[in-house]
Amino acid sequence: CDLPQTHSLGSRRTLMLLAQMRRISLFSCLKDRHDFGFPQEEFGNQFQKAETIPVLHEMIQQIFNLFSTKDSSAAWDETLLDKFYTELYQQLNDLEACVIQGVGVTETPLMKEDSILAVRKYFQRITLYLKEKKYSPCAWEVVRAEIMRSFSLSTNLQESLRSKE
């Protein structure tokens, strides 16, 4: 399945919005830094592009879930959040179309269930971290920076797979 060119643009817009959402400097939050164990190998590496699409879909769905909580709404600018949701929603639609198109075609017996679980655990670690830090401004800034990094890595791997094909 070929994702539309708008998908790449949407990924870039998503990253831009995440950058604009920054409220405080990450340097003032160095004591709150945390390794969440992002499973980046599950987004590229030896896979074919079609195999990583369900994993990328899970990633974007989890980002959507993370930023659509009550605690998130209190932490970020509402206008930017709304634009952010719109971008994520569009990307989910693009990926869902690909997943449906790929059903019965891919030869992945487990639909990358292990990769999907790794992504879910990654986001649960983030959620637990926010809870432990009582959703402080620094905790949210650490999470925003982490999501920027992991989202960028996952979409870059997708792009490199696309260019290989």
Epitope: E41, K112, S115
Partner: antibody
């Protein structure tokens, strides 16, 4: 099926690599783990390599073991074995990863590693 | 580090009887259900009996039943057979995979 090889008698501090060979399936589609069992003792989860290549180790195994995979094998490298690492080492596959990375349903027969001076 | 405590460490059962093995985790397993049960006989690799706390693995007799959620789990073997003499292990999967672990094992002796 899966089968382990490479187990032997080594002296403490001598690195050793165990190999797991898969037959009848592609390693790129499955999560593969390593579990060990010291003589007369219980099972210990060492770590797992996911289909994409992400590796997770249990706390005590980090730094002591390295798991890697190629298209046909999964390797477990013991970086600097001690006498406490004497055990049978099992390689295992899970067909149920949605239920966690300990739900191994296909196991090799195991390979014995003895660390002694 | 997480601890999975299995009780009892050894249990004796008569053929046709029922055995219950408990597995208690010091912290909730992932998704409250990421717990597996294994059977191991001397000189053999472990065999998966139950995954997802209560789902029977392929080819496992329905005499084996897994139950529980979160931190407390039970494996029940009803209508015990001679062939059930083995050591049984639980294994827990956690949000942080560095904490994944097996229980200490329970030896089942069949009389």
């Amino acid at each position: 099926s899966v089968e382990e090889s490479g187990g032997r008698l080594v002296t403490p501090g001598t690195p050793l690599t165990l190999t797991c060979i898969a037959s009848g399936f592609s390693l790129s589609s499955y999560a593969m783990g390593w579990v060990r069992q010291a003589p007369g003792k219980g099972l210990e989860w060492i770590g797992i390599v996911l289909s994409g290549g992400t590796v997770y180790y249990t706390n005590w195994a980090k730094g002591r073991f390295t798991i890697s995979k190629t298209s046909s094998t999964v390797d477990l490298k013991m970086t600097s074995p001690t006498t406490e690492d004497t055990a049978t080492y099992f390689c295992a596959r899970t067909d149920y990863p949605a239920y966690g990375f300990t739900s191994f349903n296909i196991w090799g027969p195991g390979t014995l590693v003895t660390v002694s001076s | 580090a997480q601890v999975l405590t299995q009780t009892p460490s050894s249990v004796s059962a008569a053929v046709g009887g029922t055995v219950s093995i408990s597995c208690q985790s010091s912290k909730s397993v992932y998704n409250n259900n990421c717990l597996s049960w294994f059977q191991q006989k001397p000189g053999q690799p472990p065999k998966l009996l139950i995954y997802g706390a209560s789902t029977l693995a392929s080819g496992v007799p329905s005499r084996f039943k897994g139950s529980g959620s979160g931190t407390q789990f039970t494996l029940t073997i009803s209508d015990v057979q001679c062939d059930d003499a083995a050591t049984y292990y639980c294994a827990g999967d956690y949000v942080d995979d560095m904490e994944n672990t097996f229980g200490g094992g329970t030896e089942v002796v069949v009389k």
